[in-house]
C-alpha cells in the first residue's frame, strides 16, 4: 500500500477507562496532529478507519463493530465502548485516508478494574482547593458527550468507600461537589458515579479525583528569608570550611515558580572562579507552602573569600527579596608567650 504518515504510538495519551463502563475515545489525529477537524476531512472524502493490537500481541487487527448490542461502535471521530471489557486493553490506531492521502496515529488504551471503594491503578487528576477560602466546587470530570442533555442522570458522590450525604462542610449538588469551607481534613479521593439510561440499559460512569487543600492566596506573602539573618555571624579562619544556609519560606501560590539563588560579589557562583558548591533541599507543609534551603559551601575558605559579599536571593509571584550573610575573618586568639606577656609589661 502507499505511504502513510505514521505519527507512531502517542504515549502522551495513555487512556485509562474502567472495566464495564462506557468509554468514548476521540481519534487523537484531529486533536493533536492535523490542522483540520473531522467534519472537514469527511467533507473532503477522507475515511476514518480504526484497528487495534491486543495487549501482548504484535498483530494489528480490525475492530469488530458487529458485536451484540453494538458494544463497540464508531460515531464520527469517536470510538465507543458500551461498555468496556478487560480484554479491550491494547494499542488502538485511527487512520485517515483516501486514494492520495493517509495519516495515522496509535494510542494505548488500558481497561482497569476497581474495587467497591474505587481503588484502582487509575492515575487520578488533582484538584487544589484553597484553605478556608469560602465556597469552592469540584465538578465530575469527563462526562460530556456520554448522554444527551434531555437525559437527567443520577449522580452519587463518595469519599473513599462512603457515600457523601450529610457532611458538615461538603455538599453534593448534582455534577458539582461544594466545599463550604475547605479544611486539611477534606484532603482525599472523591468519586462521582454518574448513572444514566440508554436504550433500555443502565450505564455507570465512575470518575475519581484527588482533592488537595492548599494555602489560600488571601494569606500569601512574598518570600521570607529565615537564614541568613542579622543574628548569625559566619566567623571563619582561612582554611576552614564555610557553610552558609539560605532558608526561604514561600507561601503556596498556584502556578508560581519559586526561585532561590546566591550571589557572591554580585555574581552568580557559576560566574566566579572560587570553588563553591551549592546543595538544595525542598520541603512542603501540609498546605503546600514550600521551604527551600540552599547551602553554599566553600571547602577551604581564603582570607579573600571572607571579604566577599554573600547574598541570598528569593523570588516568587509575590515578589523578590534578598539578604546578605554576615561573614568575617576570625581574629586569631592571642598566643600567651608573646602577646600576653607584652600586654602585661614583661620584658
Amino acid at each position: 500500500s502507499e505511504r502513510c504518515d505514521d505519527w507512531g504510538l502517542d504515549t502522551m495519551r495513555q487512556i485509562q477507562v474502567f472495566e464495564d463502563e462506557p468509554a468514548r475515545i476521540k481519534c487523537p489525529l484531529f486533536e493533536h496532529f492535523l490542522k483540520f477537524n473531522y467534519s472537514t476531512a469527511h467533507s473532503a472524502g477522507l475515511t476514518l478507519i480504526w484497528y487495534w493490537t491486543r495487549q501482548d500481541r504484535d498483530l494489528e487487527e480490525p475492530i469488530n463493530f458487529r458485536l451484540p448490542e453494538n458494544r463497540i461502535s464508531k460515531e464520527k471521530d469517536v470510538l465507543w465502548f458500551r461498555p468496556t471489557l478487560l480484554n479491550d486493553t491494547g494499542n488502538y490506531t485511527c487512520m485517515l485516508r483516501n486514494t492520495t492521502y493517509c495519516s495515522k496515529v496509535a494510542f494505548p488504551l488500558e481497561v482497569v478494574q476497581k474495587d467497591s471503594c474505587f481503588n484502582s491503578p487509575m492515575k487520578l487528576p488533582v484538584h487544589k482547593l484553597y484553605i478556608e477560602y469560602g465556597i469552592q466546587r469540584i465538578t465530575c470530570p469527563n462526562v460530556d458527550g456520554y448522554f444527551p442533555s434531555s437525559v437527567k442522570p443520577t449522580i452519587t458522590w463518595y469519599m473513599g468507600c462512603y457515600k457523601i450525604q450529610n457532611f458538615n462542610n461538603v455538599i453534593p449538588e448534582g455534577m458539582n461537589l461544594s466545599f463550604l469551607i475547605a479544611l486539611i481534613s477534606n484532603n482525599g479521593n472523591y468519586t462521582c458515579v454518574v448513572t444514566y439510561p440508554e436504550n433500555g440499559r443502565t450505564f455507570h460512569l465512575t470518575r475519581t479525583l484527588t482533592v488537595k487543600v492548599v494555602g489560600s492566596p488571601k494569606n500569601a506573602v512574598p518570600p521570607v528569608i529565615h537564614s541568613p539573618n542579622d543574628h548569625v555571624v559566619y566567623e571563619k579562619e582561612p582554611g576552614e570550611e564555610l557553610l552558609i544556609p539560605c532558608t526561604v519560606y514561600f507561601s503556596f501560590l498556584m502556578d508560581s515558580r519559586n526561585e532561590v539563588w546566591w550571589t557572591i560579589d554580585g555574581k552568580k557562583p557559576d560566574d566566579i572562579t572560587i570553588d563553591v558548591t551549592i546543595n538544595e533541599s525542598i520541603s512542603h507543609s501540609r498546605t503546600e507552602d514550600e521551604t527551600r534551603t540552599q547551602i553554599l559551601s566553600i571547602k577551604k575558605v581564603t582570607s579573600e573569600d571572607l571579604k566577599r559579599s554573600y547574598v541570598c536571593h528569593a523570588r516568587s509571584a509575590k515578589g523578590e527579596v534578598a539578604k546578605a550573610a554576615k561573614v568575617k575573618q576570625k581574629v586569631p586568639a592571642p598566643r600567651y608567650t608573646v602577646e600576653l606577656a607584652c600586654g602585661f609589661g614583661a620584658t
Epitope: Q113, D115, S116, C117, F118, N119, Y158, M159, G160, C161, Y162, K163, I164, Q165, N166, F167, N168, V170, S185, G188, N189
Partner: antibody, heavy 120, light 107 residues
C-alpha cells in the same frame, strides 16, 4: 495500640430498637472508617454498614437500609449503630471494626463485640 | 450480591501439617479479597488483604493466593494457636460479603 471498646450486652423486645456504641482509644479517629459487622449464634459474619466519622459519610447494606443508622461523635471518638424494628433473627453479636483507612474495605481492628438478644 | 462459598466446612489437621482452605466467589472479585481468623469468644483478626498481602504482625506461615473467583489460604505448618475458624471477605462489590467459614480443628 488501637482499641475499640463496645457497650455492654443488651436484651430487647421485638419491635424495639437498640443502640450500640464503640469507643476508639489509643489511635486517631479521624481519617479512618468504622464498619459494623454482626454474627448470629453459630453463624458467619455479615457486614451491615459503615461511616467515616470525620464527615458522617455512610454506606449501608441494602438488607438493613431503613432499619440501621450509623452515626459518630468525633469529640468522644465514638461510633454508634442503632438497629430498629428488632426481630428474633437480629439476635447476634455486633462488632465494630476499623478500616485501615477511609479507602480500605478490610478491617484491621475489631471491638470485643456486643451481644444483643431479641426475645419476648 | 456476591456469594462467597468456603470449603471444606471443617478441616481436621495435625499440628505441624499444612492446611489449605478454599474460598470461591459467585462472580469475579479480582484480587479484592481478605481473610480473617476467629477464635471462640473473640473478635475476628485480619490475616490477608488484596488476596495475598499479609497484614501487619501476621506470621509468614500464612499465605494467600488466587484471583477472580478462586482463592486459597495456606497455613504452611499449623501451630496450636492456629486452630480457629477462618473467613474470607470480598470487597469488590457492595455489599461486602463473607464466606460461611472453615473450621480448622485438631486431628
Amino acid at each position: 495500640q488501637v482499641q475499640l471498646v463496645q457497650s455492654g450486652a443488651e436484651v430487647k423486645k421485638p419491635g424495639s430498637s437498640v443502640k450500640v456504641s464503640c469507643k476508639a482509644s489509643g489511635g486517631v479517629f479521624s481519617g479512618y472508617a468504622i464498619s459494623w459487622v454482626r454474627q448470629a449464634p453459630g453463624q458467619g459474619l455479615e457486614w451491615m454498614g459503615g461511616i467515616i466519622p470525620e464527615f458522617g459519610a455512610t454506606n449501608y447494606a441494602q438488607k438493613f437500609q431503613g432499619r440501621v443508622t450509623i452515626t459518630a461523635d468525633e469529640s468522644t471518638s465514638t461510633a454508634y449503630m442503632e438497629l430498629s424494628s428488632l426481630r428474633s433473627e437480629d439476635t447476634a453479636v455486633y462488632y465494630c471494626a476499623r478500616h485501615s483507612s477511609a479507602y480500605s474495605p478490610w478491617f484491621d481492628y475489631w471491638g470485643q463485640g456486643t451481644l444483643v438478644t431479641v426475645s419476648s | 450480591e456476591i456469594v462467597m462459598t468456603q470449603s471444606p466446612a471443617t478441616l481436621s489437621v495435625s499440628p505441624g501439617e499444612r492446611a489449605t482452605l478454599s474460598c470461591r466467589a459467585s462472580q469475579s472479585v479480582s484480587s479484592n479479597l481478605a481473610w480473617y481468623q476467629q477464635k471462640p469468644g473473640q473478635a475476628p483478626r485480619l490475616l490477608i488483604y488484596g488476596a495475598s498481602t499479609r497484614a501487619t504482625g501476621i506470621p509468614a506461615r500464612f499465605s494467600g493466593s488466587g484471583s477472580g473467583t478462586e482463592f486459597t489460604l495456606t497455613i504452611s505448618s499449623l501451630q496450636s494457636e492456629d486452630f480457629a475458624v477462618y473467613y474470607c471477605q470480598q470487597y469488590n462489590n457492595w455489599p461486602w460479603t463473607f464466606g460461611q467459614g472453615t473450621k480448622v480443628e485438631i486431628k
